[in-house]
């Protein structure tokens, strides 16, 4: 099944996804979307990178880690219950049917009455499986339905890079990465 990640209402959610560029600066396009990974692209695209930069964002979605080193983990700011569901990370490796795609399930819990750390993130021990599982996730209840239009929001790439990325570094060090080249 999809690897499950949890966050509380009002917190930032973190969905990990990594690859290892074949050479420094030799990036691969990546897209993130709401909904399970379809045959092409990322369903309802919320963020994407190209061979050089992050070139499309939508409100509340950003890359916290160093995407130039292959950390394309998604952060969703200030989540609500509506953010629950399946997300698709697609690493668009050039060639004939080479894409790597991962379905990640985000579960949003109501905020606790007691104060909670503002950057709390809850990961399952199954995280490395996300990066070794190929193909499509199994049946589950979340559906795409009619996909809404997306509004662009300008987000500073520099600000994204300056954000705290220690957790992403820890995850990368676990060796759960896709190697390209």
């Amino acid at each position: 099944s999809e690897v499950e990640y949890r966050a509380e209402v009002g917190q930032n959610a973190y969905l990990p996804c990594f690859y290892t560029p074949a050479a420094p600066g030799n990036l691969v396009p990546v897209c993130w979307g709401k909904g399970a990974c379809p045959v092409f692209e990322c369903g309802n695209v919320v963020l994407r990178t190209d061979e050089r930069d992050v070139n499309y964002w939508t409100s509340r979605y950003w890359l916290n880690g160093d995407f130039r080193k292959g950390d394309v983990s998604l952060t969703i700011e200030n989540v609500t219950l509506a953010d629950s569901g399946i997300y698709c990370c697609r690493i668009q490796i050039p060639g004939i049917m080479n894409d790597e795609k991962f379905n990640l399930k985000l579960v949003i819990k109501p905020a606790k009455v007691t104060p909670a750390p503002t950057r709390q993130r809850d990961f399952t021990a199954a995280f490395p499986r996300m990066l070794t599982t190929r193909g499509h996730g199994p049946a589950e209840t979340q559906t795409l339905g009619s996909l809404p239009d997306i509004n662009l929001t300008q987000i500073s790439t520099l600000a994204n890079e300056l954000r705290d990325s220690r957790l992403a570094n820890d995850l990368r060090d676990s060796g759960a990465t896709i190697r390209i080249g």
């Epitope: 045959v39 695209v45 499309y56 668009q92 979340q142 559906t143 339905g145 996909l147 997306i150």
Partner: antibody, heavy 122, light 107 residues
């Protein structure tokens, strides 16, 4: 107005080659995945191949990928299908179709050309 | 491969009838399903995408529903121009696959 116009079909002998073209207009060609879909006489629809925005990624029906090659020229707003080692069972009307766009969302072949007939026969 | 099975294969109906065509996927395809209408000698025309969103210019008598593995296309009141062949198609797994078609004929 979105328009897709196929050309290049015709009669070819088994083992021969053919190159189909599709001229696109009325939309930003480089913002969309493109596809070829075929239909044998009196039969249903069969997907053949897809290509991403810049041509760097391609997708094929497994049984065709060793003989068919999809490509595109965004400067010319054109899509191509190179067909080699043609067989009688490749006889069909070949349609060019516009697929999903750069921001995802709409998963269906929204626009189709009129089709071009390929007949493989000796 | 994901198999798409349509039923019925053919259907006779009269103008004004309500008609439902079903499509079943062999695996979960979420809502990545499209419906097309094709008339003899013509290219297919997109009716519905993402299982339930009506394509631009399609009359509101057409509607799609379903998710996962079971989907339906409904025509609420058949018009003379609706007699055609209808196909479902999934956009979830590779290869993309179509149903075998449902031929809608005049009774």
């Amino acid at each position: 107005e979105v328009k897709l116009v196929e050309s290049g079909g015709g009669l070819v002998q088994p083992g021969g080659s053919l190159r189909l073209s599709c001229a696109a207009s009325g939309f930003t060609f480089s913002d969309y995945y493109m596809a070829w879909v075929r239909q044998a006489p009196g039969k249903g629809l069969e997907w053949v191949a897809n290509i991403n925005y810049d041509g760097s990624s391609t997708y094929y029906l497994d049984s065709l990928k060793s003989r068919f090659t999809i490509s595109r020229d965004n400067a010319k707003n054109s899509l191509y299908l190179q067909m080699n080692s043609l067989k009688a069972e490749d006889t069909a009307v070949y349609y060019c179709a516009r697929d999903v766009g750069y921001y995802g969302g709409n998963y269906g072949f929204a626009y189709w050309g009129q089709g071009t007939l390929v007949t493989v026969s000796s | 491969d994901i198999q798409m099975t349509q039923s019925p294969s053919s259907l006779s109906a009269s103008v004004g009838d309500r008609v439902t065509i079903t499509c079943r996927a062999s695996d979960n395809i979420y809502s990545y399903l499209a419906w097309y209408q094709q008339k003899p000698g013509k290219a297919p025309k997109l009716l519905v995408y993402n299982a339930k969103t009506l394509a631009e210019g399609v009359p509101s008598r057409f509607s799609g529903s379903g998710s996962g593995t079971d989907f339906t296309l409904t025509i609420s009141s058949l018009q003379p121009e609706d007699f055609a062949t209808y196909y479902c198609q999934q956009h979830y797994g590779s290869p993309l696959t179509f149903g075998q078609g449902t031929k809608l004929e005049i009774k």
